[in-house]
């Protein structure tokens, strides 16, 4: 999916008002100091690319975060202010076998969502240049 | 298997107000949310309403301010308060809950009661 037509202040006052505070939630109990952030983005379309992909992608020692409420909000907004973007999940659903997977919060999970936080937070300042 | 039965749609005229219910066969936030799609004739559905099970909510441009979406856990049912109608409203309107990981389950949506807003 193309980002490139999103309402990027819509999305970015959902991550303020609550998505944020659900990451939060999330990583409440480690240091913010604890995971080095690997993952960059270069602009906003960008962002959400990675965002989209380390929330909803299953990785290797971390297969439950789409389950998670951050995870839900950030579907709905994308659903909500890209264009077409809903119809592209809907039709992608059609070939997916129902997975019913257990919310298992693992140390590589805390660790992805770290790299959640710094793309968000990298999302909403894109005039910053890159490191 | 979740069912979901949507109701409330009818004839309404601009301005108007109307209310569409969405009854599930079981925890209507047991997979954390609900949301309102529409349909249009010839155009793509849209998501127009997210609630969680936290109470947050979202809700598309072009129904801000003038649509509540809310749910009633005691009665596993979702609504859709739908004030100031306009014609672009019309459509039809499809509640579904999020039952799959990635992406939004067709298995889960009703049949979609029509909403047409018409003097």
């Known amino acids: 999916y193309d980002f490139t037509n999103c309402d990027f202040e819509k999305i970015k006052a959902a991550y303020l008002s609550t998505i944020s505070k659900d990451l939060i939630t999330y990583m409440s109990g480690t240091k913010s100091t604890e995971f080095n952030n690997t993952v960059s983005c270069s602009n906003r379309p960008h962002c959400l690319t990675e965002i989209q992909s380390l929330t909803f992608n299953p990785t290797a020692g971390c297969a439950s975060l789409a389950k998670e409420m951050f995870a839900m909000k950030t579907k709905a907004a994308l659903a909500i202010w890209c264009p077409g973007y809903s119809e592209t999940q809907i039709n992608a659903t059609q070939a997916m076998k129902k997975r019913r997977k257990r919310k298992v919060t693992t140390n590589k999970c805390l660790e992805q969502v770290s790299q959640l936080q710094g793309l968000w937070r990298r999302f909403n300042r894109p005039l910053l240049k890159q490191q | 298997e979740v069912q979901l039965v949507e109701s409330g749609g009818g004839l309404v005229q601009p301005g108007g107000s109307l209310r569409l219910s969405c009854a599930a066969s079981g925890n209507i936030f047991a997979n954390n949310i609900m949301g309102w799609f529409r349909q249009a004739p010839g155009k793509e559905r849209e998501l127009v309403s997210a609630i969680f099970s936290d109470g947050s909510t979202y809700y598309a441009d072009s129904v801000k301010g003038r649509f509540t979406i809310s749910a009633d856990n005691s009665k596993n049912t979702a609504y859709l308060q739908m004030n100031s109608l306009k014609p672009e409203d019309t459509a039809v309107y499809y509640c579904?809950?999020?039952?799959?990981?990635?992406?939004?389950?067709?298995?889960?949506w009703g049949q979609g009661p029509l909403m047409t807003v018409s003097s």
């Open positions: 579904a809950r999020d039952d799959i990981v990635g992406a939004w389950s067709l298995d889960c």
